[in-house]
Interface confidence: medium
Amino acid sequence: DTEIKVNPPQDFEIVDPGYLGYLYLQWQPPLSLDHFKECTVEYELKYRNIGSETWKTIITKNLHYKDGFDLNKGIEAKIHTLLPWQCTNGSEVQSSWAETTYWISPQGIPETKVQDMDCVYYNWQYLLCSWKPGIGVLLDTNYNLFYWYEGLDHALQCVDYIKADGQNIGCRFPYLEASDYKDFYICVNGSSENKPIRSSYFTFQLQNIVKPLPPVYLTFTRESSCEIKLKWSIPLGPIPARCFDYEIEIREDDTTLVTATVENETYTLKTTNETRQLCFVVRSKVNIYCSDDGIWSEWSDKQCWEGEDLSKKTLLR
């Protein structure tokens, strides 16, 4: 029996469409597939950022694949052809690997890129990113932010920069339609008359950087002689009630009594008849049902009851 062989795919390349990290990997069918006309050829694609220990592996019948990468590092990929066992009367046949790499030739020394990039999606409504200028860069250096997510035709530049001493140090984003639960890509590059500036690339998902508004309208209600119900309302905005976790801090007679995390807008507290003062604050965070991560809101305004014996009155602030 002659050994069945197959060639690797042709013209394997990584194409950058200008989406700040979302790249196309594409290829053409291997040469000499005439023997296997009745066969559906498959391709095994492996790719990673250079320096990563693990490869991502995809098996596909298509001639392209798209995914997001960290453009601060290079990318390497390899692909080979697979002939399923149905085509070869027995075992699967694999071609040799075709390999390719891609990287953006870095300009400037690493110290010139922006420092301490921080992005917060306030109340799941307003995205704000801020940064510090690179180390030792001159005041003539200015930074520009570009962003892209799936659904935009092309990368967009920030139109509302936050400035300090004439330098851009942040961006207030416009309304970002249908932008959550997908990768959000940012590039901050820079220009200076004196020296080249290193670009920085960032990728995150907006629902994971949400900082909600604090809860509002805190109230007390006497439930029984030894129980008080603390209650509050979710802040206005697009975040549904099911997406909140709350942290409560309760002080009884100036002593920290309880810190608790709860999933709904009430908390029942056991008290004694001797309690003279009760204060509590609440803060909110998007929970694990709606995001993988989040930022605690600021604490609500403190709500207190003092003076009258708590057991004698219904407490509706």
Partner: antibody, heavy 119, light 111 residues
């Protein structure tokens, strides 16, 4: 608990001015907007303006044609409303009223200050 | 200015029955997906009390029988089962644009 305590009733001559105070307690004064609303005898409510004590930002109802001035003193947690060029139709109860933000309504009101304008 | 028109001017309802008050704005009071519409109750000799904010959210300590609905220009305050202590004047108010404006009020009485 939250309290807004207003200054006492006033009787004023037409053409004069009145300044009503509103002392806030039981909450962080600078975290809430302070509104001023008036109500003529037997009539409805009329919003006069508001101040954000945090940064001093003020919005007025232009119907008062520059006759109203709203101020706030963070150090004493007190808001003030001054109405000048008084006329008889300014006779009303004037309320200060706390609001968390524009979409949250006005959740605490002062007891009201009756200003009577009469010659 | 946004003009708020309330109807009816007065309303008499039997104890335990449903009371419905309507408010229409001269233009939409919605923004950012929120309706900037609030409802207040005022009893004689007292300042108003916030019942409903953002069209449908209850203020602090407001009984569950009070509810609000609507969006855009048309809004409704509903008292599901009228109690004696609900006799008052009810006002709607928009806070989308300065100047904030109130409806003319609806006087609710017991039949």
């Amino acid at each position: 608990q939250v309290q807004l305590v207003q200054s006492g009733a006033e009787v004023k001559k037409p053409g004069s001015s009145v300044k009503v105070s509103c002392k806030a307690s039981g909450y962080t004064f600078s975290n809430y907007l302070m509104n001023w609303v008036r109500q003529a005898p037997g009539q409805g409510l009329e919003w006069m303006g508001r101040i954000d004590p945090y940064d001093g930002d003020i919005d007025y109802n232009q119907n008062f044609k520059d006759r109203v001035t709203i101020t706030a003193d963070k150090s004493t947690s007190t808001a003030y409303m001054e109405l000048s060029s008084l006329r008889s139709e300014d006779t009303a109860v004037y309320y200060c009223a706390r609001g968390y933000g524009t979409a949250y309504g006005v959740d605490y009101w002062g007891q009201g200050t009756l200003v009577t304008v009469s010659s | 200015d946004i003009v708020m028109t309330q109807s009816p001017d007065s309303l008499a309802v039997s104890l335990g029955e449903r009371a419905t008050i309507n408010c229409r704005a001269s233009e939409s009071v919605d923004n950012y997906g929120i309706s900037f519409m609030n409802w207040y109750q005022q009893k004689p000799g007292q300042p108003p009390k916030l019942l409903i904010y953002a069209a449908s959210r209850q203020g602090s300590g407001v009984p569950d029988r009070f509810s609000g609905s609507g969006s855009g220009t048309d809004f409704t305050l509903t008292i599901s089962s009228l109690q004696a202590e609900d006799v008052a004047v009810y006002y709607c108010q928009q806070s989308k644009e300065v100047p904030w404006t109130f409806g003319g009020g609806t006087k609710l009485e017991i039949k």
